[in-house]
């Protein structure tokens, strides 16, 4: 059971979803061990709380790792008010938190 730091990816909402009036930004953590990981969302460097949802996979039978997704959900109007979207990940396999981000409209 070797410690394994997560690979972290951030995904902006799709154009199709934005047309429906909502925006989901997804932070994906892949192949980490142990299971305990923290995801914090920042929008234009302001910490977000209460508007995200997490789900974690069962332990992988081959390598004993986990994956987790955290979804930040906003209205399209709120999403378009801001520019920088970031998720910050804390895990025992990381010596310091890892942040992945994107600038709205540039990806």
């Amino acid at each position: 059971r070797t410690v394994a730091a997560p690979s972290v990816f951030i995904f902006p909402p799709s154009d199709e979803q934005l047309k429906s009036g909502t925006a989901s930004v997804v932070c994906l953590l892949n192949n980490f061990y142990p299971r305990e990981a923290k995801v914090q969302w920042k929008v234009d460097n302001a910490l977000q709380s209460g508007n995200s949802q997490e789900s974690v996979t069962e332990q992988d039978s081959k390598d004993s790792t986990y994956s987790l997704s955290s979804t930040l959900t906003l209205s399209k109007a709120d999403y378009e008010k801001h520019k920088v979207y970031a998720c910050e990940v804390t895990h025992q396999g990381l010596s310091s938190p890892v942040t992945k981000s994107f600038n709205r409209g540039e990806c």
Partner: antibody, heavy 119, light 107 residues
Framework: DVQLQESGPGLVNPSQSLSLTCTVT?????????WNWIRQFPGNKLEWMGY???????SYNPSLKSRISITRDTSKNQFFLQLNSVATEDTATYYC????????????WGAGTTVTVSS | DIQMTQSPASLSASVGETVTITCRAS??????LTWYLQKQGKSPQLLVN???TLAEGVPSRFSGSGSGSQFSLKINSLQPEDFGTYYC?????????FGGGTKLEIK
């Protein structure tokens, strides 16, 4: 400062469910902590039972998985333990405790509440 | 599950003496080990985290060492308030497990 306080019945009948509440003050349970239950048996052995995280994810000790449920009420800043089908071996002092993501160890403990399972 | 084995189970010492308690993990837990002291009728209190970092307010006569699977807690110049039961616990993946405790009594 985070403070935790356990509450619940001190006596539970065998085969019934044990239900305990942990009230958290000084910090929101949707913050950066995982909220745990640990019990200490009469012989002093400590057993981690499970946690509910800041986001509502749960993790349980496999030895209890079929009997345990940890839930929360964010509006009251409380989390709960339910242990089903209790037996005399579940007699213990039950502690709620927390760890901060990034530190991982139990830094804050409640005073504990003693539960006796007996008819 | 990771098994934590503490030794000795009990220990009798005098004020001013130096004592060492050891803790062995059944597998590699890196430095994810915590030491607690529990006094009669009280909750465990944090002493040392990450194998060697003293918790806030813990006197410097306490020191933790080790990594991997072998750890120790040393107490120099025992004071009356140091007597009680010491527990080690790993915080590397669930289920978190504790050692059986070392009861330190006044000789």
């Amino acid at each position: 400062d985070v403070q935790l306080q356990e509450s619940g019945p001190g006596l539970v009948n065998p085969s019934q469910s044990l239900s305990l509440t942990c009230t958290v003050t000084g910090y929101s349970i949707t913050g950066d902590y995982a909220w745990n239950w640990i019990r200490q048996f009469p012989g002093n052995k400590l057993e981690w039972m499970g946690y509910i995280s800041y986001s509502g994810l749960t993790s349980y000790n496999p030895s209890l998985k079929s009997r345990i449920s940890i839930t929360r009420d964010t509006s009251k800043n409380q989390f709960f333990l339910q242990l089903n089908s209790v037996a005399t071996e579940d007699t213990a002092t039950y502690y709620c405790t927390s760890f901060y993501y990034g530190y991982w160890y139990f830094d804050v403990w409640g005073a504990g509440t003693t539960v006796t399972v007996s008819s | 599950d990771i098994q934590m084995t503490q030794s000795p189970a009990s220990l009798s010492a005098s004020v001013g003496e130096t004592v060492t308690i050891t803790c062995r993990a059944s597998e590699n837990i890196y430095s994810f080990l915590t030491w607690y002291l529990q006094k009669q009728g009280k909750s465990p209190q944090l002493l040392v985290n990450n194998a060697k970092t003293l918790a806030e307010g813990v006197p410097s006569r306490f020191s933790g060492s080790g990594s991997g699977s072998q750890f120790s807690l040393k107490i120099n110049s025992l004071q009356p308030e140091d007597f009680g039961t010491y527990y080690c616990q790993h915080h590397y993946g669930t289920p978190y497990t504790f050692g059986g405790g070392t009861k330190l009594e006044i000789k």
